[in-house]
C-alpha cells in the first residue's frame, strides 16, 4: 500500500513517542560521536516536519523518501568532515548510495568511554526530566551498538525506567539500582550481538543464509506450527531485520509491530506458549515473542527416514523444487531437535543435500541414499563432545580460569590478533560456559554454540575493520554454519614470529589495585595473552605458574602500606622469574 | 467431502499467458493448502506450485518460478494460476489439489486427499 508521504504514515502508525526514539537512535548509529544535544536538535526538526506531513501529506518535500530526508538532515551536520573524515564523503552522493555508504561508515568499536552507574547524579536528572534522560539511554547505547535492533532498544528503555522509578526513592540507591543496572547491561550486549549477527549474515551470505538461520530457529520454537505457516513468519521476520540493518527503523519497527499482531492473531496454530505474550503492550509483546520458550513438541510426529531416505521419489522432489525440499527438510529436522544448536542443524541441511546431489546422479539413488541419516551421527558427535570437555574443564576450574584456558586457546590460533580482541573474545567465550554449562544435559549443546555464534561473530566482525590473519577471514567469510567447527579446529599458528619481549607490557602499577575487579582481570588477562604472542609454545603449566605469580604479586602490592614502591621493586623480579619459567 | 471444479485452460502462443482457476466445495477447513500439479503425455506427476489457505504463503517448482503466480480468494473459496511467458514444455494436464497442511510435504502428491478434475494447457511455438 503506497502512501503519499512516508514519513507521516510512519509517524501515524508508530506515535510521536516512538517515532522520537526511533529516529534519536538511526540518528546516533549513523553519527557515533556527535554530542547528545545536536542529536536531539536533528530529531526535533525532524519530528515537527513529520507533524507537518501528518496534517497535510501534499506539503511541501513530504513526498521524499525517508533515506533523502533522513540522510538531507546527517549531512546538514557543520562538523561532519571535522569529527567523521571521509563519511563526510557520503554527502555528495544521490541515494540510495548515499545511505549505503552511510552505513559502511558504521563503527563496530567507536572509541568511546565505558558508562559507570552514578546513582544520585542519574536519579536527580531522572527525576528533573525523565524523556531527556530516556533519550540519552537511547543515545549512549545506540552510539556504542550502531547495530542495536531500534524497536527492542525502545523495549530496554522501559526496562532502564522501571530500575530508576523503583529505585531512585528507595534508601540505598545503589544496592538498589547497581545489580539491575548489571542485568540489563548483559540483556543488552546479548541483544546486541544477536541482532550483528543477523546483520553481519546479511553482508557476508545474503537474505538466503538469514532465511534457513530462521527456519531452523522457528521451527524449534513453534513444533507446532506447520510449513506454510513457518515459512510466512520467517518472510516477514527476514524484511524486518533487513530492514533495521539498513537503518531502516521506522519501517522496521513497523513491520515488526504489524509481524507481532498476526502471530498473536494465530497464535492458536503457531504456537501454546504465546498467550503470555500477546496480552502485553507492544514493546513488551514484540520482546516476548521473540523470547518465547520453545513449544512442545507434538506427540504425533513420525520418523523422518521414509520421507527423506525410504521414499523412491526422493530425487524427482529434489529435482522438481530444490528450495521448498530442502526447506521442509530443514523445517521437519529443526522441529524434533530443540536440543540441536541452529548452525548444527544447518549443517546437517547441508549434508543432507551435498548426499542428495551425488545420490540423484548415480544409477541407484534409492540405495546411496538410504544410508543418509547415518551421515549425520559425526556432525552431532562432535560438539557434544566439545562441549562436554569445556563444561568439564569449566566445572573444574571456575569462571575466571576457565576464560584464561580460552584465551590462551585463542591467542594460540590467531596471535596476530590485538590484545584487546583476545581479551574481549575470551571472556565472553568463557561466559558461555557460565550460561550454559549450569543447564540440562539437552539445552547444554544449543546454549554453548547459539551463544558462540555471536561471540565468533564479534571475532569477525572486529577482525573484518583491521584484518590480520588469513585463517581468521576464511573461517569468518567461508559459511556461517561452519564457522565454529572451522575456528575449533585452528591449531597454532606455525608461521607467526614471536612478539618480543618488553618489559613495559608487564609492568604493573599501584593504579591496578583500585580498579574493580572485572577491570583487575583484564589487565591479568591482557598479560596472559601478551604472554602467549610471547612464547607461544609455552605449556599450560608454564602459563599457570606464570599467571599464578603474577596474581600473587598484585595481591600482595595491593596490600602493602606503599604500594607503588612494592610494584617498582617487585615488578622486575617478576618479569625476570617469568621469563625463566618459559624459557 | 472436498470438490473441487476447474476452469480456465486452453490454447495459447509461446510467451503468452493464461490463468487457471480452482474453486473449493464441501467441508472446507482451515490449515489447508492447495497445490498445483501438471502431467505431460507419458510423464509423472510433476508438482508447479502451493498456496497456504491460512496465510496466503506460496511455494513455487523451480521450473515455473518468476513466471507463475498462485493466489487465493477467501470468499469465494477459489484459487487462482497465473501463467506468463509460457513456454511448449508447460503444455500438460493442469490440476489442483487439497490437503492439511501440517503435512510439509507440498510437493508430493500422495499426501494430497482431494483431487480437481484437470484441465489441459498447450503451448504452441
Known amino acids: 500500500d503506497t502512501h503519499k508521504s512516508e514519513i507521516a504514515h510512519r509517524f501515524n502508525d508508530l506515535g510521536e513517542k516512538h517515532f522520537k526514539g526511533l529516529v534519536l537512535v538511526a540518528f546516533s548509529q549513523y553519527l557515533q560521536q556527535c554530542p547528545f544535544e545536536d542529536h536531539v536538535k536533528l530529531v526535533n526538526e525532524v519530528t515537527e516536519f513529520a507533524k507537518k506531513c501528518a496534517a497535510d501529506e501534499s506539503a511541501e518535500n513530504c513526498d521524499k523518501s525517508l533515506h533523502t530526508l533522513f540522510g538531507d538532515k546527517l549531512c546538514t551536520v557543520a562538523t561532519l568532515r571535522a569529527t567523521y573524515g571521509e563519511l563526510a564523503d557520503c554527502c555528495e552522493k544521490q541515494e540510495p548510495e548515499r545511505n549505503e555508504c552511510f552505513l559502511t561508515h558504521k563503527d563496530d568499536h567507536p572509541n568511546l568511554p565505558k558508562l559507570k552507574p552514578e546513582p544520585d547524579a542519574q536519579c536527580a536528572a531522572f527525576q528533573e526530566d525523565p524523556d531527556k534522560f530516556l533519550g540519552k539511554y537511547l543515545y549512549e547505547v545506540a552510539r556504542r551498538h550502531p547495530y542495536f535492533y531500534g524497536p527492542e532498544l525502545l523495549f530496554h528503555a522501559e526496562e532502564y525506567k522501571a530500575d530508576f522509578t523503583e529505585c531512585c526513592p528507595a534508601d540505598d540507591k545503589l544496592a538498589c539500582l547497581i545489580p539491575k543496572l548489571d542485568a540489563l547491561k548483559e540483556r543488552i550486549l546479548l541483544s546486541s550481538a544477536k541482532e550483528r549477527l543477523k546483520c553481519s549474515s546479511f553482508q557476508n551470505f545474503g537474505e538466503r543464509a538469514v532465511k534457513a538461520w530462521s527456519v531452523a530457529r522457528l521451527s524449534q520454537k513453534f513444533p507446532k506450527a506447520d510449513f506454510a505457516e513457518v515459512s510466512k513468519i520467517v518472510t516477514d521476520l527476514t524484511k524486518v531485520h533487513k530492514e533495521c540493518c539498513h537503518g531502516d527503523l521506522l519501517e522496521c519497527a513497523d513491520d515488526r509491530a504489524d509481524l507481532a499482531k498476526y502471530i498473536c492473531e494465530h497464535q492458536d496454530s503457531i504456537s501454546g506458549k504465546l498467550k503470555a505474550c500477546c496480552d502485553k503492550p507492544l514493546l513488551q509483546k514484540s520482546h516476548c515473542i521473540a523470547e518465547v520458550k520453545e513449544d512442545d513438541l507434538p506427540s504425533d510426529l513420525p520418523a523422518l527416514a521414509a520421507d527423506f531416505a525410504e521414499d523412491k521419489e526422493i530425487c524427482k522432489h529434489y529435482k522438481d523444487a530444490k528450495d521448498v525440499f530442502l526447506g521442509t527438510f530443514l523445517y521437519e529436522y529443526s522441529r524434533r531437535h530443540p536440543d540441536y544448536s541452529v548452525s548444527l542443524l544447518l549443517r546437517i541441511a547441508k549434508t543432507y543435500e551435498a548426499t542428495l546431489e551425488k545420490c540423484c546422479a548415480e544409477a541407484d539413488p534409492p540405495a546411496c541414499y538410504r544410508t543418509v541419516f547415518d551421515q549425520f551421527t559425526p556432525l552431532v558427535e562432535e560438539p557434544k563432545s566439545l562441549v562436554k570437555k569445556n563444561c568439564d574443564l569449566f566445572e573444574e576450574v571456575g569462571e575466571y580460569d576457565f576464560q584464561n584456558a580460552l584465551i590462551v586457546r585463542y591467542t594460540k590460533k590467531a596471535p596476530q590478533v590485538s590484545t584487546p580482541t583476545l581479551v574481549e573474545i575470551g571472556r565472553t567465550l568463557g561466559k558461555v560456559g557460565s550460561r550454559c554449562c549450569k543447564l540440562p544435559e539437552s539445552e547444554r549443546l544449543p546454549c554453548s554454540e547459539n551463544h558462540l555464534a555471536l561471540a565468533l561473530n564479534r571475532l569477525c566482525v572486529l577482525h573484518e575493520k583491521t584484518p590480520v590473519s588469513e585463517k581468521i577471514t576464511k573461517c569468518c567469510t567461508d559459511s556461517l554454519a561452519e564457522r565454529r567447527p572451522c575456528f575449533s579446529a585452528l591449531e597454532l599458528d606455525e608461521g607467526y614470529v614471536p612478539k618480543e619481549f618488553k618489559a613495559e607490557t608487564f609492568t604493573f602499577h599501584a593504579d591496578i589495585c583500585t580498579l574493580p575487579e572485572d577491570e583487575k582481570q583484564i589487565k591479568k588477562q591482557s598479560a596472559l595473552a601478551e604472554l602467549v604472542k610471547h612464547k607461544p609454545k609455552a605449556t599450560k603449566e608454564q602459563l599457570k605458574t606464570v599467571l599464578g605469580n603474577f596474581s600473587a604479586f598484585v595481591a600482595k602490592c595491593c596490600g602493602r602500606e606503599d604500594k607503588e614502591a612494592c610494584f617498582a621493586e617487585e615488578g622486575p623480579k617478576l618479569v625476570a622469574s617469568s621469563q625463566l619459567a618459559l624459557a | 467431502q472436498v470438490q473441487l471444479q476447474q476452469s480456465g485452460g486452453g490454447l495459447v502462443q509461446a510467451g503468452g499467458s493464461l490463468r487457471l482457476s480452482c474453486a473449493a466445495s464441501?467441508?472446507?477447513?482451515?490449515?489447508?493448502?492447495m497445490g498445483w500439479f501438471r502431467q505431460a503425455p507419458g510423464k509423472d506427476r510433476e508438482f508447479v506450485g502451493v498456496?497456504?489457505?491460512?496465510?496466503?504463503?506460496?511455494f513455487y517448482s523451480d521450473s515455473v518460478k518468476g513466471r507463475f503466480t498462485m493466489s487465493r480468494e477467501i470468499a469465494k473459496k477459489t484459487v487462482h494460476l497465473q501463467m506468463n511467458s509460457l513456454k511448449p514444455e508447460d503444455t500438460a494436464v493442469y490440476y489442483c489439489?487439497?490437503?492439511?497442511?501440517?503435512?510439509?510435504?507440498?510437493?508430493?502428491?500422495?499426501?494430497?486427499?482431494?483431487w480437481g478434475p484437470g484441465t489441459q494447457v498447450t503451448v504452441s511455438s
Open positions: 498456496i497456504s489457505w491460512d496465510n496466503g504463503v506460496t
Open positions: 489439489a487439497a490437503g492439511n497442511a501440517l503435512h510439509s510435504r507440498y510437493y508430493s502428491p500422495s499426501k494430497y486427499d482431494y
Open positions: 464441501g467441508r472446507f477447513f482451515s490449515r489447508q493448502v
